[in-house]
């Protein structure tokens, strides 16, 4: 778990004050209303591979 | 096993002062949000305040902003709840509780309570 | 701010019975729903949490449904035990978060 102002979340969480840890954005695309994912509004979404070519 | 034990309640006057703790013990106690929970003699469940693992996040209920303070001491793994300008209304069993999961999605460990009784 | 609303407020019921309690919230909260178990002048007990999961120690008796607003719980058999005060939780607003008013199952 990292402090803020060092090195970012990883692509697709955001920091989270509340937690002290980084939030993984995917779990607040059901919970948009929570403090939590407060950062992940802005946040890019998480990359996904495509299951086909 | 995991125990969380608060202390620190009683009788106290309308706009007096108290405060709470929560000690807890059988668990690594930093990493976890903590709240405090109150319930008034025969009523249910209120949330009063939220803190984050480091201390640094903290919430209230607003009928209690501005008046109650929540701080925790991870070396000593002790939970606080400052009470001030006490009101008859605050009259309630305070519980501390253990917010459970990644996201403090819900509380698994509680403590037993303390009764804050406010009257003159 | 969500409200949560269950009902009934009590219930009579006799060992042996399958039981059911309703929570409704006033928007939706997903699956972001917990129950909790409560006996007179004792703290609250953890039941089930974001919906359906059982939590660890609890009998299977208990179970939990619902997603959106409307949720359940449900004892499949009452036990001497099981005579309490039920409250659920909404977290889908984490931190800020509130309970139903209960629900008191007393002995018929």
């Known amino acids: 778990e990292q402090a803020p102002g060092t090195a970012p979340c990883s692509r697709g969480s955001s920091w989270s004050a509340d937690l002290d840890k980084c939030m993984d954005c995917a779990s607040c695309r059901a919970r948009p209303k929570s403090d939590f994912c407060l950062g992940c509004a802005a946040a890019p979404p998480a990359p996904f591979r495509l299951l086909w070519p | 096993e995991v125990q969380l034990l608060e202390s620190g309640g009683g009788l106290v006057q309308p706009g007096g002062s108290l405060r709470l703790s929560c000690a807890a013990s059988?668990?690594?106690?930093?990493?976890?949000?903590m709240i405090w929970v109150r319930q008034a003699p025969g009523k249910g469940l209120e949330w009063v305040s939220y803190?984050?693992?480091?201390?640094?996040?903290?919430h209230y209920a607003d009928s209690v902003k501005g008046r109650f303070t929540i701080s925790r001491d991870n070396s000593k793994n002790t939970l606080y709840l400052q009470m001030n300008s006490l009101r008859a209304e605050d009259t309630a069993v305070y519980y501390c509780?253990?917010?459970?999961?990644?996201?403090?999605?819900?509380?698994?460990?509680w403590g037993q309570g303390t009764l804050v009784t406010v009257s003159s | 701010d969500i409200q949560m609303t269950q009902s009934p407020s009590s219930l009579s019921a006799s060992v042996g019975d399958r039981v059911t309690i309703t929570c409704r919230a006033s928007?939706?909260?997903?699956?972001?729903l917990n129950w909790y178990q409560q006996k007179p002048g004792k703290a609250p007990k953890l039941l089930i949490y974001?919906?359906?999961s059982l939590q660890s120690g609890v009998p299977s008796r208990f179970s939990g449904s619902g997603s959106g607003t409307d949720f359940t719980l449900t004892i499949s058999s009452l036990q001497p035990e099981d005579f309490a005060t039920y409250y659920c939780?909404?977290?889908?607003?984490?931190?800020?978060?509130?309970f139903g008013q209960g629900t008191k199952v007393e002995i018929k």
């Open positions: 509780a253990r917010g459970g999961d990644t996201y403090f999605d819900y509380f698994d460990y």
């Open positions: 059988g668990f690594t106690f930093s990493p976890y949000p």
């Open positions: 803190i984050s693992p480091s201390g640094g996040s903290t």
């Open positions: 928007q939706s909260i997903s699956g972001y």
């Open positions: 974001q919906a359906s």
């Open positions: 939780q909404q977290s889908y607003t984490s931190p800020f978060i509130t």
